[in-house]
């Protein structure tokens, strides 16, 4: 999904006449069209800030199949999407929700739960240092032939 706009919700003002863009910006929830501030369409597009240069509203984000919708798109705020329960958004792949691990490797203990923003957190029992990286057993692989694993995916 696109980066979420979490600006506070504002009430869209009615359409207003303007003689030039410098007279004053269109309000959040509006865009400039032929000298007029026109409203965005509820649930379809939005503008989150007052503006005097946007010639169209911004299309609302649609949450993808790995996400849940926390709040719908309004004329002044984009949809807010969050990874579904049991998955998290990786820093290096922010468009994807990845499955959280359910346990820590041997010799480690869980100190942090799965959240929509992070995998479970594991630390070494003795040293207390964090574990980074995958549990080898859940490495992503593809088949080279039925029932035969090939090397891990990128």
């Amino acid at each position: 999904i696109t980066q979420q706009d979490l600006a506070p919700q504002q009430r869209a003002a009615p359409q207003q006449k303007r003689s030039s863009p410098s007279e004053g910006p269109c309000l959040a929830g509006q865009y400039l069209s032929e000298g007029n501030c026109k409203p965005c369409r509820e649930g379809i597009d939005y503008t989150s800030h007052s503006n005097h240069s946007l010639d169209s509203c911004i299309l609302c984000t649609r949450c993808d199949s790995g996400e849940v919708e926390l709040s719908p798109c309004t004329t002044t705020r984009n949809t807010v999407c969050q990874c579904e329960e049991g998955t998290f958004r990786e820093e290096d792949s922010p468009e994807m929700c990845r499955k959280c691990r359910t346990g820590c490797p041997r010799g480690m203990v869980k100190v942090g739960d799965c959240t929509p923003w992070s995998d479970i957190e594991c630390v070494h029992k003795e040293s207390g240092t964090k574990h980074s990286g995958e549990v080898p057993a859940v490495e992503e692989t593809v088949t080279s032939s039925p029932g035969t694993p090939a090397s891990p995916c990128s």
Partner: antibody, heavy 118, light 107 residues
Framework: EVQLQQSGAEVVKPGASVKLSCKAS????????IHWVKQAPGQGLEWIGR????????KYDPKFQGKATITTDTSSNTAYMELSSLRSEDTAVYYC???????????WGQGTLVTVSS | EIVMTQSPATLSVSPGERATLSCRAS??????LHWYQQKPGQAPRLLIK???QSITGIPARFSGSGSGTEFTLTISSLQSEDFAVYYC?????????FGQGTKLEIK
């Protein structure tokens, strides 16, 4: 070694039910999603549904809702799909598939052929 | 549901030549499009994820492109083992859907 070992071919009578199994090895199914995909003879691929074995949450294609029921037994690292009220059009190879991400299928079982015949 | 349409249904190409397979979505799916190869009697295997991301173990001659509704799988120089059926799949919205497949055959 990562593997999805599916149960053997089944011949079943119309109206009956069948339960297919998919035993995972080399990984913990709770750390992945398990999907099932149908392929009728000489036809393309159809996604049936998905389960998150960690919490049991399922999603189905509406056309398979009521036809397929996907479950898991995490203690044996096995996924199941039960097909009910079988008809000749349910004759197909059924694949269990896994994904670390829900969006695509990174590892496929060898498939189970289900033949519905009187 | 999102309908995935692949073209052509059958593509005849000589070994060593380039093959271009197309996949169209009935609505925008961003880059949430994945390609699979299936040989007779075998399970499909993942070739390309997210329209253009390569998969370790898949030869570099396989590449993908596209975004929105139009996607392409290109095989730069066909090898004998590449003749198979290719499927695209969208993972953007439920239910997940596949294209009907393109059969790549030897000319």
């Amino acid at each position: 070694e990562v593997q999805l070992q599916q149960s053997g071919a089944e011949v079943v009578k119309p109206g009956a039910s069948v339960k297919l199994s998919c035993k995972a090895s080399g990984f913990n199914i709770k750390d992945t999603f398990i999907h099932w995909v149908k392929q009728a003879p000489g036809q393309g691929l159809e996604w049936i549904g998905r389960i998150d074995p960690a919490n049991g949450n399922t999603k189905y294609d509406p056309k398979f809702q009521g036809k397929a029921t996907i479950t898991t037994d995490t203690s044996s690292n096995t996924a199941y799909m039960e097909l009910s009220s079988l008809r000749s059009e349910d004759t197909a190879v059924y694949y269990c598939v896994r994904g670390l991400y829900t969006y695509y299928f990174d590892y496929w079982g060898q498939g189970t052929l289900v033949t519905v015949s009187s | 549901e999102i309908v995935m349409t692949q073209s052509p249904a059958t593509l005849s190409v000589s070994p060593g030549e380039r093959a271009t397979l197309s996949c169209r979505a009935s609505q925008s799916i961003s880059n949430n499009l994945h390609w699979y190869q299936q040989k007779p009697g075998q399970a499909p295997r993942l070739l390309i994820k997210f329209a253009s991301q390569s998969i370790t173990g898949i030869p570099a001659r396989f590449s993908g492109s596209g975004s929105g509704t139009e996607f392409t799988l290109t095989i730069s120089s066909l090898q004998s083992e590449d003749f198979a059926v290719y499927y695209c799949q969208q993972g953007n919205s439920w239910p997940y859907t596949f294209g009907q497949g393109t059969k790549l055959e030897i000319k």
